[in-house]
């Protein structure tokens, strides 16, 4: 990944972190009626060798990790990304001010892994 | 963000990069008979606002990008990860020195996206 952290910040292993998102903070309060926000969560952390079972790593991620160890300046570590996502239902105003109930897919992180 | 960039440079968007992996370099030449290596590829690049259609972003990634803009020190950008992976067939020796032909899933990156 293109992100660089200070050497003093030791990153923990890839995992799910809790994150509540307020639609008001996003400036969406005028068109989203409900909910007021939701537990979106996010993934963060290191995908370092060895990738254990908790990291839900793909075969490619395992290979990439080994190549990164051999060639760290050119091949990055795999990144920590969602492996399971859930939908949420949102009540909102459409462009014609109709009230719509819609299910939005892939909104909530349920699990993370190395990819 | 904790990243250091040259302000004059544009960040490169999340995309697939070519990578050939040699099984000899991985030290696997004694048990993998064929192929000698394969085009594994990898994903790298920025998942920055706005996430365009090429970035195959999930709804969660779009929300996370907006939250990152509001709170960059605590919520990272989404990461650039494989969205499509292919299998490869490998001819190898098992623990009993039998020759096995096996299809290994999720070995080759075909496409990348922001997750």
């Amino acid at each position: 990944s293109a992100s660089d952290y200070n050497s003093s910040e030791l990153k923990t292993a890839c995992r799910k972190h809790e994150l509540y998102v307020s639609f008001q903070d996003l400036g969406w309060q005028d068109w989203i009626i409900a909910p007021k926000g939701y537990a979106a969560n996010y993934c963060d952390g290191e995908c370092s060798f060895p990738l254990n079972a908790h990291m839900n790593a793909t075969n490619h991620a395992i290979v990439q990790t080994l190549v990164h160890l051999m060639n760290p300046e050119y091949v990055p570590k795999p990144c920590c990304a969602p492996t399971k996502l859930n939908a949420i239902s949102v009540l909102y105003f459409d462009d014609n001010s109709n009230v719509i109930l819609k299910k939005y897919r892939n909104m909530v992180v349920r699990a993370c892994g190395c990819h | 963000s904790a990243s250091d960039y040259n302000s004059s440079e544009l960040k490169t968007a999340c995309r697939k990069h070519e990578l050939y992996v040699s099984f000899q370099d991985l030290g696997w030449q004694d048990w993998i008979i064929a192929p000698k290596g394969y085009a594994a590829n990898y994903c790298d690049g920025e998942c920055s606002f706005p996430l365009n259609a090429h970035m195959n972003a999930t709804n969660h990634a779009i929300v996370q990008t907006l939250v990152h803009l509001m709170n960059p020190e605590y919520v990272p950008k989404p990461c650039c990860a494989p969205t499509k992976l292919n299998a490869i067939s490998v001819l190898y020796f098992d623990d009993n020195s039998n020759v096995i032909l096996k299809k290994y899933r999720n070995m080759v990156v075909r496409a990348c996206g922001c997750h």
Epitope: A2, S3, D4, Y5, N6, S7, E9, L10, K11, E46, S48, F49, L66, L69, M70, N71, P72, E73, Y74, P76, K77 | S3, D4, Y5, N6, E9, K11, T12, H17, D25, D44, G45, E46
Partner: antibody, heavy 121, light 111 residues
Framework: QVQLVESGGGLVKPGGSLRLSCAAS????????VHWVRQAPGKGLEWVGR??????????MYAAPVKGRFTISRDDSKNTLYLQMNSLKTEDTAVYYC????????????WGQGTLVTVSS | QSVLTQPPSVSGAPGQRVTISCTGS?????????VHWYQQLPGTAPKLLIY???ERPSGVPDRFSGSKSGTSASLAITGLQAEDEADYYC???????????FGGGTKLTVL
Amino acid sequence: QVQLVESGGGLVKPGGSLRLSCAASGFTFSSYVVHWVRQAPGKGLEWVGRIKRESSSYTTMYAAPVKGRFTISRDDSKNTLYLQMNSLKTEDTAVYYCARVERSKSGFDNWGQGTLVTVSS
Amino acid sequence: QSVLTQPPSVSGAPGQRVTISCTGSSSNIGAGYSVHWYQQLPGTAPKLLIYGQSERPSGVPDRFSGSKSGTSASLAITGLQAEDEADYYCQSWDSSQTLVVFGGGTKLTVL
């Protein structure tokens, strides 16, 4: 043949600034990750920092002693690497080398001859 | 103090074999990262001697060999020659941030 030539070293007072350059030739500069490494008189090698390629968003990273004071940049059109050094301290006195990273195992396969930076009042 | 630990000096007579150790930790060599070795002759820039633990760039004699085990690596020089007198450095990466780390250097004296 592959060549890296540093320039811009010299005598500077504590708190001063200096910009080092590293001119590359004999290879496709834009395809390589490049680093700065320094060596204080009579001491060992100390990593300063690096800059990645365009494909990795020219990401930079720095060693703790120089972070926030030094900035690495590159101009691929000029095949040149730069090290901008600000708020210099006496302990920054060293020979500064630029080094190219080979692309299969990430070793520093080519080094410049070095340029001496002396920080003294 | 360097992240990787090397003996400050080693010596040997011409024709002998010497080894230089490089001890790291679980966050660098022990994390699986490659180890490289550099030779620095007096008054010159360092030169890549061994890369990826045990591979030699073209032009490096096969008298030089490298190995790695656990959190340590070593450089072996057989058939010692007067021109081998130099400083030798090991180098790897720190796993948490992919920062480059060097050993403190070892001065080889050919007696």
